[in-house]
């Protein structure tokens, strides 16, 4: 009778995580007497996966009924495969012996690769906001996928980005892999409503890529533009000065009026008008009792936005000669009118 051969017909098997893997093995003979065992890996560090002779292997079932003597099929099925199960599996015939069974012949091995889906991509933006025309970085991370081949793309409002760098770790063989990508995005004033999207394509996703998103509203600060103007008034002894604060984001804004450098009134923006591009407008006005002033008045609208250094705009209010003649020495506190919204600038 010809010497026993151990046949592992498949060089490789690929299985999706969570499924069962069937590893095929056949013997050409029943001789010699002794058990078959399955190992992952070779050499001294190999891991016992199944031993026909003894042991408890809850995830392993034999494909054929091994208690039938004429059975030469020693294929096994391993349930609930995870990426940690990847490796080369060897079907090995032993000859009965003492003190240990003697390895008689091994199959050529079957490489088990596990297809594992990447985790949902997590996109994170910069820790601090930046202003338009500046470049900010967004990162995208996904983990636990196998095999290593993966495609990552970045989009801003549907337009593919090109300025990004991607790494897949580890560089060598591993049971599963992680991807990390950093994209550089130049902010524009209209980016409050913009989104960046990280899109990942992998063999396990069957053409339906995973996406992670981040809103540029979390990353952008659009500083306000200020305009101070005088509105016409019926009353001769009153002047109405408005401060139009336009196109700012985010909402947080504090406005201070100064008369000749002295704080007249401070208020926090509350009822804001939202523009189509996501920025906000706000208007504040100041009623100035002109008869309280002998000389011209410099009115300053000072705005502190989102914790940044204050910006200001001044307006010189001219006091007419007639008002000066009839003016009083008593300085009245300037009356600050309640705020009123200004129509959106679109």
């Amino acid at each position: 009778e010809d010497e026993l051969q151990v046949i592992q017909p498949e060089k490789s098997v690929s299985v999706a995580a969570g499924e069962s893997a069937t590893l095929r093995c056949a013997m050409t003979s029943l001789i010699p007497v002794g058990p078959i065992m399955w190992f992952r890996g070779a050499g001294a560090g190999r891991e016992l996966i199944y031993n026909q002779k003894e042991g408890h292997f809850p995830r392993v079932t034999t494909v054929s009924e091994l208690t039938k003597r004429n059975n030469l099929d020693f294929s096994i099925s391993i349930s609930n495969i995870t990426p940690a199960d990847a490796g080369t599996y060897y079907c090995v015939k032993f000859r009965k012996g003492s003190p240990d069974d003697v390895e008689f012949k091994s199959g050529a091995g079957t490489e088990l690769s596990v297809r594992a889906k990447p985790s949902a991509p997590v996109v994170s933006g910069p820790a601090v906001r930046a202003t338009p025309e500046h470049t900010v970085s967004f990162t995208c991370e996904s983990h636990g996928f196998s095999p290593r081949d993966i495609t990552l793309k970045w989009f801003k409002n549907g337009n593919e980005l090109s300025d990004f760098q991607t790494n897949v770790d580890p560089a060598g063989d591993s049971v599963s892999y992680s991807i990390h990508s950093t994209a550089r995005v130049v902010l524009t004033r209209g980016d409050v409503h913009s989104q960046v999207i990280c899109e990942i394509a992998h063999i396990t996703l069957q053409g339906d890529p995973l996406r992670g998103t981040a809103n540029l509203s979390e990353a952008i600060r659009v500083p306000p533009t200020l305009e101070v103007t005088q509105q016409p008034m019926r009353a001769e002894n009153q002047a109405n000065v408005t401060c139009q604060v336009s196109n700012f984001y985010p909402r947080g804004l504090q406005l201070t009026w100064l008369e000749n450098g002295n704080v007249s009134r401070t208020e926090t923006a509350s009822t804001l008008i939202e523009n189509k591009d996501g920025t906000y407008n706000w208007m504040s006005w100041l009623l100035v009792n002109t008869c309280a002033h002998r000389d011209d008045v410099v009115l300053t609208c000072q705005v502190e936005h989102d914790g940044q250094q204050a910006v200001s705009k001044s307006y010189a209010l001219e006091i007419s000669a007639h008002q000066k003649e009839h003016g009083s020495d008593i300085t009245h506190e300037a009356a600050l009118a309640p705020t009123a919204p200004l129509g959106g600038s679109g």
Partner: antibody, heavy 118, light 107 residues
Framework: EVQLVESGGGLVQPGGSLRLSCAAS????????MHWVRQATGKGLEWVSA???????YYTGSVKGRFTISRENAKNSLYLQMNSLRAGDTAVYYC????????????WGQGTMVTVSS | DIQMTQSPSSLSASVGDRVTITCRAS??????AAWFQQKPGKAPKSLIY???SLHSGVPSKFSGSGSGTDFTLTISSLQPEDFATYYC?????????FGQGTKLEIK
């Protein structure tokens, strides 16, 4: 049903011969290592002989050269040809099937009595 | 040849008792030890193979353990049908050899 049935035992004079048969049913005898085990009255079990699936044969020292184990696949039967019998060979002879992969005894026949006496 | 030494040769016990029979091989036999039960006038019955594996249909009150040279058969709760003679065997190499037997008697 898996079964082994021995036959051929009896009374024989010292120096005589006897051929024991074991008819297997419920399985293919040629696919298993097969054994003969004997037990003298009031004594323990003694392994006598075996035949492997490849036709390889094995004997205990006391019967070597006198006993021959064989099988006939067409009849699904095992045999033990016993020559030059001695009083010490008197025993019940059991036909036993070896296990699937390790040759552990799993199926026993009911036994046949061999008496060697003048 | 490998010698198999069983102890005790005989043992008296009561129904419900837990009993242990030991077997020592004269040299290492890996775990190729088997245990058999025989009742008077009957053929032996296979109980355990590879030291601890139960043959099909054998109740779980029978258990075996050991490796190398020392092996045990334990019957967890004796029933009247368990009173019999028990044999150990090595089957790692020819000639296969049996222990001399342990007769388990009712007390």
């Amino acid at each position: 049903e898996v079964q082994l049935v021995e036959s051929g035992g009896g009374l024989v004079q010292p120096g005589g011969s006897l051929r024991l048969s074991c008819a297997a049913s419920g399985f293919t005898l040629s696919s298993y290592d097969m054994h003969w085990v004997r037990q003298a009255t009031g004594k323990g079990l003694e392994w006598v002989s075996a035949i492997g699936t490849a036709g390889d044969t094995y004997y205990t020292g006391s019967v070597k050269g006198r006993f021959t184990i064989s099988r006939e696949n067409a009849k699904n039967s095992l045999y033990l040809q016993m020559n030059s019998l001695r009083a010490g060979d008197t025993a019940v002879y059991y036909c036993v099937r070896g296990g699937v992969w390790d040759d552990a005894f799993d199926i026993w026949g009911q036994g046949t009595m061999v008496t060697v006496s003048s | 040849d490998i010698q198999m030494t069983q102890s005790p040769s005989s043992l008296s016990a009561s129904v419900g008792d837990r009993v242990t029979i030991t077997c020592r091989a004269s040299q290492g036999i890996n775990n190729y030890a088997a245990w058999f039960q025989q009742k008077p006038g009957k053929a032996p019955k296979s109980l355990i193979y590879t030291a601890s594996s139960l043959h099909s249909g054998v109740p779980s009150k029978f258990s075996g353990s050991g490796s190398g040279t020392d092996f045990t058969l334990t019957i967890s709760s004796l029933q009247p049908e368990d009173f019999a003679t028990y044999y150990c065997q090595q089957y790692v190499s020819y000639p296969y050899t049996f222990g001399q037997g342990t007769k388990l008697e009712i007390k």
